[in-house]
Amino acid sequence: IQIPEEYEGHHVMEPPVITEQSPRRLVVFPTDDISLKCEASGKPEVQFRWTRDGVHFKPKEELGVTVYQSPHSGSFTITGNNSNFAQRFQGIYRCFASNKLGTAMSHEIRLMAEGAPKWPKETVKPVEVEEGESVVLPCNPPPSAEPLRIYWMNSKILHIKQDERVTMGQNGNLYFANVLTSDNHSDYICHAHFPGTRTIIQKEPIDLRVKATNSMIDRKPRLLFPTNSSSHLVALQGQPLVLECIAEGFPTPTIKWLRPSGPMPADRVTYQNHNKTLQLLKVGEEDDGEYRCLAENSLGSARHAYYVTVEAAPYWLHKPQSHLYGPGETARLDCQVQGRPQPEVTWRINGIPVEELAKDQKYRIQRGALILSNVQPSDTMVTQCEARNRHGLLLANAYIYVVQLPAKILTADNQTYMAVQGSTAYLLCKAFGAPVPSVQWLDEDGTTVLQDERFFPYANGTLGIRDLQANDTGRYFCLAANDQNNVTIMANLKVKDATQITQGPRSTIEKKGSRVTFTCQASFDPSLQPSITWRGDGRDLQELGDSDKYFIEDGRLVIHSLDYSDQGNYSCVASTELDVVESRAQLLVVGSPGP
């Protein structure tokens, strides 16, 4: 049920609803405060509690930190006294918002503390290589929870030029397909930029020493990355897919990409890094299959096969929705999800997994739906449906709120309805209550009106009366009742004479240049405001300003200076505020001008 806006004067409580929460993944840096957000609405006022890694967590009781707790909110901020304090608070957090109607639950918030990035101290030996050979300069940046950006530069902060021969891989290593004496430098420096902490750190410089040779030997391509002949990758639906092939050889190999299983989706594919990288935007199911890279030079080729399996984090097919119910109704919450692999769905009631609840509960779970029959006010609850697979987790809170509300008629009492004989009148009686009230219509004698087959009720309480007769005029009573009370309103019906066109316009043939007069006479109920208007081929005709084309008055239409364009159907429309009737005539204009 839905409580109509007009249903006033009854205080209805509200189960808790989470309105704001922190993102599922929260990375904090050494200088940051920890702020976890959890806001919820509800009546009576909502109480909040937190868990960390499934255990009750009380921020106020943590030692050595300052905690600011927002009033009327579950949000809190922890400020530490040293740069390492955040490490203590890493974990998976969850907020629970409760009032007497139930408990809503936030999603899992994974808090990760990122330390100040440092490259481990290492002694970097010079890399010695003969001209024409391949080489890989490793970067191996420290791990980071947030994506970082890698640059190779020299000591003058100039970027190392990259081309088909020299390229940086996704992993940050710098690959040389073959080295030239001009690559001989002592200051190849890998820089790692950490946007979260707004810091850049650099590795110890690598000294690349290239020994000159008189005879560079041609080599057929060999893959430096990936090194094996095939690999299996999982791509996530809706996310980008990046495939990379970096080859060595002399002369420098070129890279081609093929898709043996079908055409390459040209509108979504981009090739970067001199064709060494294939990027597929927004992966879909149809992108499943084999992708092959081919490295070629004059001596031969090398290949790598990527076998891509497209999987998907859980997504909603049908998210459970909160609803109000009246006593005795059946509540059904649908939780239908899709994903690859197929997600596992679990239900909670007021934040407690259903497996942990007593077995005598009246709910049943059937094909992704939680069903409660014959609900009562005590069945009010907030449910949680959670779906997870290895790629992610979905959570929805939805409440079942069972309300008991007295019957009320929302249609005004003593309304007057007017309709014309022969038409259908609709007497309104919009009632609301919980349980849903029954509605019946009675005549002035208190007898049900439904004995006359011309009277027919609608589910929304409206009474229809068809083929109205003059003696249907009178007072009618609508009675609405539920197990708490009953209420009545009165409706007055006045049946008026129907508008009739007693003499309509006649079809006619007229000469071009002449004029034509159409007349229309109608009878109206004397108590109603009559109107006669004219239409020409469906559009309203009016006397147009200074134009003398039309003259309209007293049920008479005169069309002057007839032309062929005036041919068509002309209608007299007789109307009141209650009914409309129309009579049509055809005008044909023939040649040979008249007056």
Epitope: S514, V516, T517, T519, D548, R556, G594
Partner: antibody, heavy 120, light 107 residues
Amino acid sequence: QVQLVQSGAEVKKPGASVKVSCKASGYTFTGYWMHWVRQAPGQGLEWIGEINPSNGRTNYNERFQGRVTLTVDKSISTAYMELSRLRSDDTAVYYCARDYYGTSYNFDYWGQGTLVTVSS
Amino acid sequence: DIQMTQSPSSLSASVGDRVTITCKANEDINNRLAWYQQKPGKAPKLLISGATNLVTGVPSRFSGSGSGKDYTLTISSLQPEDFATYYCQQYWSTPFTFGQGTKLEIK
């Protein structure tokens, strides 16, 4: 109720002009064309012409073209017929008549008639 | 101009008689025919328009028929007040022309 009241009888000499008036009441003057018809003594009816009081547009019987002028004064709901270069065979009763409510070019209300006598 | 020929030019009849007056045009006038009644010293009175349509207030003993060039006015049962002169008028083409009239007298 609809009424058309014409001016009184006139006696004119040949070659003179006569102007007959027709005052309308009981309806919207500008909504109906006004016709003029004459009837010589003991003879039939003859259509002279018509005028649209709304904009002054006229249509004349060619037999009278150049001699007859139809005009209106909307402010007093009056139509006029002036016939010039009178001849003795112009002696007749001159009627104004309103376009019929239900169609055009026939006449539902008539004035009482004005006798114009042309005699030397 | 379209010529309208009425016949007879005069007619004697008694109260209660059925009377027919005809009007012939020299070309097709597409039912654009009106009938008028005129009593001595009075202006004509419109009886029928569109060949067959009785004007409001005219007794139903009057009726019109015909099409093309030939039209008829019928009085089904003559009443004393019906003795008068009757004119037909075509209004298909200008100038609008009248028949020469049919004088209906008491026998």
